[in-house]
């Protein structure tokens, strides 16, 4: 993928609302291009914060002003609506509502949209074909919630337009505006270290790979040309500078470490894999 992001690409907004009691509540809103956070919401000033220089996409200042106002109104109303219906819906304080909504892109074309709401971390209701539907496992509370939400088709139409018109237009502009950033190639650095001892006579070898972009990477412990199937790959973790970090570990008997190496493949290396030999690494660390 030329944009350095794995298909399918998505843009989504998440709203995490914590209701501690009848009058004390808090919310966190953020916007994401796949796994890259591009926007956040400043609750104090009720404004959208653009986290990347290209986070505005190709939307005008006027469009941003309108969206900001829409989010402000909807946040206030959503909070109030949930607070008002909490007792009726048997929501027990403290509780958390998580909402995620956005759209997906496949091969440069919009492939769909989504909007889901969870209560206490479990699927509750979702928005499909212009109306709210309960998740079957969520029971009667979710059915009642949908009944309330679906009383207002015009409100649902506004939601539908956000998902099926505004979001697709935005994600295309965002990808275009962020092209240089998203298509950049940053070479990884790699180093080896000992992990905590797995037991007597055994070693844990750790291969650290950091500072790479885009995210897809291949890391493997090798013996000669033989991939070591015992390689344990950790999660690829984000770094503050927008690059990624990964560690791959291998447990071996102390005497079998000598001819092991860690091999790293990444698009930025243009076929010139990084290979680090355990026997060459200093015993520090």
């Amino acid at each position: 993928n030329a944009d350095g992001l794995k298909e399918p690409l998505s843009f989504h907004v998440t709203w995490i609302a914590s209701f501690y009691n009848h009058s004390w509540k808090q919310n966190l809103v953020s916007g994401w291009l796949s796994d890259l956070q591009t926007h956040t919401w400043d609750s104090n000033s009720s404004t959208i914060v653009f986290l990347c220089p290209w986070s505005r996409g190709n939307f005008s200042n006027e469009e941003w002003k309108e969206l900001e106002t829409l989010f402000r109104i909807r946040t206030i109303r959503s909070f109030e609506g949930i607070r008002r219906y909490a007792h009726e819906l048997q929501f027990e304080y403290p509780f958390e509502i998580q909402v995620t909504g956005g759209c997906e892109l496949h091969s440069g074309k919009v492939s769909g949209s989504f909007l889901q709401l969870a209560y206490q971390g479990s699927d509750f209701v979702s928005f499909q074909n212009n109306s709210w539907l309960p998740y079957p496992v969520a029971g009667n509370m979710a059915k009642h919630f949908c009944k309330v939400l679906n009383q207002n088709q015009h409100e649902n139409d506004i939601t539908h337009n956000l998902l099926s018109d505004t979001c697709p237009r935005f994600i295309l502009g965002l990808l275009d505006a962020g092209k240089a950033h998203l298509q950049r190639q940053v070479k990884p650095e790699a180093w080896l270290s000992h992990g905590p001892s797995p037991g007597p006579g055994h070693l844990q070898l750790v291969c650290h790979v950091s500072g790479f972009y885009p995210k897809p990477v291949w890391v493997m412990w090798m013996r000669g040309e033989q991939e070591q199937q015992g390689t344990q790959r950790g999660d690829i973790l984000p770094s503050a500078d927008g690059t990624w970090y990964l560690r791959a570990t291998l447990e071996v008997a102390a005497g079998e470490a000598a001819d092991l190496s860690c091999r790293v493949k990444h698009s930025s290396l243009e076929g010139q894999d990084i290979v680090l030999y355990w026997e060459h690494h200093s015993s520090v660390g």
């Epitope: 309108e66 109104i73 088709q153 015009h154 539908h160």
Partner: antibody, heavy 112, light 110 residues
């Protein structure tokens, strides 16, 4: 832009349809409202047709008006006009919740 | 249904002065309020939406504020061109599918 047409002098009880023509934007992504203004009086909201075609009316307007649309026009039918319906009728585009684009209005006079 | 009460019905101000128009909703409308300006023979023009956001091209001497049920439009440094009638509107009453307007305030500039 939006432009209203169809306003004229009618006798009480004669149904009248006003048309609002939208250009430069799609009625499938915008709701449209009808608002009227009697001579020397304030603005009075009549009703709205949402992007999906759902219609909502002010309580006083239910049964007296019908809103419908095609891909490029929005109609307001005054089912049985009375002299109190004499007014300039405006069509306006709704962006999210506010009316940001208005037509010049069309004058309806109901008189015997 | 939400009802909008706008005061005063008429106000006069000298050029450079300040005008304040109030709008009260019969229930909390969550800042979903718009202000419009209308001059004789013209359609209304959107001034402010979301209670405080200035519409495109509107001079910064217009300021909207308020929350809950109480909202205010303030015109600072009034100019001759501001002579018009101003309307507030609950920009969407989801309980009764209405968008009711206030009665209007005529601003006369001396």
């Amino acid at each position: 832009s939006v432009e209203e047409s169809g306003g004229r002098l009618v006798t009480p009880g004669t149904p009248l349809t006003l048309t609002c023509t939208a250009s430069g934007f799609s009625l499938s992504t915008y709701a449209m409202s009808w608002v009227r203004q009697a001579p020397g009086k304030g603005l009075e909201w009549i009703g709205i047709i949402s992007s999906s075609g759902s219609t909502y009316y002010a309580s006083w307007a239910k049964g007296r008006f019908t809103i419908s649309k095609t891909s490029t026009t929005v109609d307001l039918k005054i089912t049985s006009p009375t002299t109190e319906d004499t007014a300039t009728y405006f069509c306006a585009r709704e962006t999210w919740y506010w009316l940001d684009l208005w037509g010049q209005g069309t004058l309806v006079t109901v008189s015997s | 249904a939400v009802e909008m009460t706008q005061t005063p019905a008429s106000v006069s101000a000298a050029v450079g002065g300040t005008v304040t128009i109030n709008c009260q909703a019969s229930e909390d409308i969550y800042s979903n309020l718009a202000w419009y300006q209308q001059k004789p023979g013209q359609p209304p023009k959107l001034l402010i939406y979301g209670a405080s956001t200035l519409a495109s091209g509107v001079p910064s001497r217009f300021k909207g504020s308020g929350s809950g049920t109480e909202y205010t439009l303030t015109i600072s440094g009034v100019q001759c061109d501001d002579a018009a009638t101003y309307y507030c509107q609950c920009a969407y009453d989801s309980s009764s599918y209405g968008t009711p307007f206030g009665g209007g305030t005529e601003v006369v500039v001396k």
